[in-house]
């Protein structure tokens, strides 16, 4: 369970917009296949899925990092800079550590979901039936 | 601070295209990530989110207008503009722009004093 | 779309009693477990003027005097004690879903 931080959905909600304009994130990646979604078990059932258990995976890497210890105690303390131009996603230079380890992480799923074919009938998914360790 | 100022026609006939204009004063509307919307109010009293322009120039409009409506803007001016073809008495309205807040979420901390758009023959 | 119903739609309440306003919405509007509905305040002639965002969470510079609760469809915007300033009409907002939509206002006056 990544337990993703509240801001960084809002941050990652807009990342996903920049690279797939017009798609509803909320709507589309939560709750998809074993991994979209609070926490994660179980084998990725697509794609799509795998690019969320990497972007879980990346946030516990985070929650390692001495920089991002305040991540477990206060969520809402986290944020970072980034620009959207065209479909680009650009971290900014000036995010310190763990900003920057997060941002990243954001970056590269989105971009993953952009290229990652999506299953509406993994939306949704029976995770107690398809998704058990 | 930032500000926000709509202006426009006022009173149109029915049938006619409209142009309203948002004019951002203290950010440039390219910068951080922000989301720039129209919002309006119906009849004094009905809230309806019309679309936005993103800082990167991308739109998104309600369904139940996107056949009518288009957002674009002018990087040189900071300004957005909402484009709404073939009005009638029910696009009467005040007219708001408006931006989404500092941390990322879709809700909206600036807002314009608003402008009316009265349809009328 | 979520259909969000705000009830009553007008309300009369004394000067320093509380005022209970509530959103219901067609869906659910929390995702990470978080609630993404927001509170705005509108007076004649004046845009709106955001009061709570994320269900709970108190705007900058607004009165203690206002808070907000709920979850998943049911929300609740309270005023208390209720102040002369306080008359408006009171607007709840979902961002859960792309398509933003509000509440059909609720008009708040004095006893």
């Known amino acids: 369970d990544s337990g993703i931080s509240p801001r960084a959905v809002w941050q990652f909600r807009k990342m996903i917009k920049c690279v797939i304009p017009g798609s509803d994130p909320f709507l589309e990646y939560n709750n998809y296949g074993c991994y979209c979604g609070l926490g994660g078990s179980g084998t990725p059932v697509d794609e799509l899925d795998k690019c969320c258990q990497t972007h879980d995976n990346c946030y516990d890497q985070a929650k390692k990092l001495d920089s991002c210890k305040f991540l477990l105690d206060n969520p809402y303390t986290h944020t970072y800079s980034y620009s959207c131009s065209g479909s680009a996603i650009t971290c900014s230079s000036k995010n310190k550590e763990c900003e920057a380890f997060i941002c990243n992480c954001d970056r590269n799923a989105a971009i993953c979901f952009s290229k990652a074919p999506y299953n509406k009938a993994h939306k949704n998914l029976d995770t107690k039936k398809y998704c058990q360790s | 601070d930032v500000q926000v100022q709509e202006s426009g026609p006022g009173l149109v006939k029915p049938s006619q295209t409209v142009s309203l204009n948002c004019t951002v004063t203290?950010?440039?509307?390219?910068?951080?990530?922000y989301y720039w919307s129209w919002i309006r109010l119906v009849s004094g009293s009905k809230l309806e989110w019309i679309?936005?322009?993103?800082?990167?120039?991308?739109?998104d409009i309600n369904p139940s207008l996107k056949s009518r409506i288009s957002i674009t803007r002018d990087i040189s001016k900071n300004q957005f503009f909402l484009h709404l073809n073939s009005v009638t008495a029910e696009d009467t309205a005040t007219y708001y722009c408006?931006?989404?807040?500092?941390?990322?979420?879709?809700?909206?901390?600036?807002w314009g004093q608003g402008t009316t758009l009265t349809v009328s023959s | 779309d979520i259909v969000l119903t705000q009830s009553p739609a007008s309300l009369a309440v004394s000067l320093g009693q509380r005022a209970t306003i509530s959103c219901r919405a067609s869906?659910?509007?929390?995702?990470?477990?978080?609630?993404?509905m927001h509170w705005y305040q509108q007076k004649p002639g004046q845009p709106p003027k955001l009061l709570i965002y994320?269900?709970?969470n108190l705007e900058s510079g607004i009165p203690a005097r206002f808070s907000g609760s709920g979850s998943r469809t049911d929300f609740t915007l309270t005023i208390n004690p209720v102040e002369t300033d306080d008359v408006a009409t009171y607007y709840c907002q979902q961002s859960s879903r792309d398509l933003f939509t509000f509440g059909g206002g609720t008009k708040l006056e004095i006893k």
């Open positions: 994320r269900a709970s």
């Open positions: 869906e659910s509007v929390d995702n990470y477990g978080i609630s993404f």
């Open positions: 408006a931006r989404d807040s500092t941390d990322g979420d879709f809700y909206f901390e600036k």
């Open positions: 203290g950010h440039s509307i390219t910068d951080d990530n």
């Open positions: 679309g936005y322009i993103t800082s990167s120039g991308s739109t």
